[in-house]
């Protein structure tokens, strides 16, 4: 198992959380492993226990402080180690000098709400959660709308190339149930990726007005 296919991937949420996934083919499910964080210019160290998420995959969250506290900056380097117990000792399985702001994945947007809905359009707003003030306006969003009879995967992606926490959906069908999701990504970072999708927001367009002769 030691020389099997291993993966170690971590992301910083830009505030006070580093989430890591460790996978190793052939490793035993009950193997006890942890991630240890050792910053280069901070006095704290942090450890989290890797818990199984699938057959050969484990995950954990390094909680660095209060959710909205800015625990790391663009100049920080955090050495991350995967340590697994082998008998009475811990063995180093993976090491990475992690640059937090090169490996960003923000929290999913929250507080989605319908601001205004009509027969053919709907205005929706949202908020970003636990995002660093360092980004200023350097964020982008993707949104998608689930139409009746379709899947999320079929939904076309709408791209907002700026920090715009609202959208006006148009060309909707009257009196129809829809769902809406949005995700966010900083422009910064070589390995930065999209946040998870927000919780879906369900809404219904207004029925068309009845004609005079009907």
């Amino acid at each position: 198992a030691v020389n099997g296919t291993s993966q170690f991937t971590c992301f910083y949420n830009s505030r006070a959380n580093i989430s890591c996934v460790w996978s190793q083919d052939g490793a035993l499910q009950d193997t006890s492993c942890q991630v240890h964080a050792w910053p280069d210019r901070r006095r704290w160290n942090q450890t989290c226990e890797l818990l199984p998420v699938s057959q050969a995959s484990w995950a954990c969250n390094l909680i660095l402080g209060a959710p909205d506290s800015q625990k790391l900056t663009t100049v920080d380097i955090v050495t991350l180690r995967v340590l697994c117990r082998e008998g009475v000792r811990w063995r180093v399985m993976a090491i990475q000098d992690f640059k937090p702001f090169e490996n960003l994945r923000l929290m999913a947007p929250i507080s989605l709400q319908v601001v205004h809905v009509e027969t053919h359009r709907c205005n929706i707003s949202w908020e970003i959660s636990q995002a660093s003030h360092y980004f200023e306006r350097h964020l982008e969003f993707e949104a998608r709308t689930l139409s009746p009879g379709h899947t999320w995967e079929e939904a076309p992606l709408l791209t907002l190339k700026q920090k715009q926490e609202w959208i006006c959906l148009e060309t909707l069908t009257p009196d129809t149930q829809y769902e809406f999701q949005v995700r966010v990504k900083p422009l910064q970072g070589e390995f930065t990726t999209w946040s998870p999708w927000s919780q879906p927001l369900a809404f219904r367009t207004k029925p068309a007005a009845l004609g005079k002769d009907t």
């Epitope: 030691v2 020389n3 099997g4 296919t5 291993s6 170690f8 190793q24 050792w38 280069d40 380097i77 050495t79 180690r81 995967v82 063995r91 180093v92 399985m93 993976a94 090491i95 990475q96 000098d97 992690f98 640059k99 090169e102 970072g189 070589e190 390995f191």
Partner: nanobody, 127 residues
């Protein structure tokens, strides 16, 4: 594109020392890992040592542990392999390699983890 150029190889007596250097140029990565591999005649390429981006983590093959030391100088874009107590079985072509993801460790020693390679430098240890 990335260029890696090794130097410092040569002929040395058993028990002697050599210092290999690897100069990197071209595209840079935010937090790559670099490593040394070697290939003896008629054998497969094998992992020797690896180092994380800031040099805060290292990994060594059992066969060279306590004899070889890998270091790097990011200001000069250099990686070094200090080899001491050399043995005839250390004779090989030594290659410098780069892994953009920056992760090293026992499960990350396979050569297919490394996307960029140098041309190699010959090390011969005479008995």
């Amino acid at each position: 594109e990335v260029q890696l150029v090794e130097s410092g190889g040569g002929l040395v007596q058993a028990g002697g020392s050599l210092r290999l250097s690897c100069a990197a140029s071209g595209r840079t990565f935010s937090s790559d890992a670099k490593a040394w591999f070697r290939q003896a005649p008629g054998k497969e390429r094998e992992f020797v040592a690896a180092i994380t981006w800031a040099g805060r983590g290292t990994d060594y093959a059992d066969s060279v542990k306590d004899r070889f030391t890998i270091t790097r100088d990011n200001a000069k874009n250099m990686v070094y392999l200090q080899m001491s107590s050399l043995k005839p079985e250390d004779t090989a072509v030594y290659y410098c390699a780069l892994n953009p993801t920056g992760v090293i460790g026992p499960g990350f020693r396979n050569s297919n983890r490394y996307d960029y390679w140098g041309q190699g430098t010959q090390v011969t240890v005479a008995s």
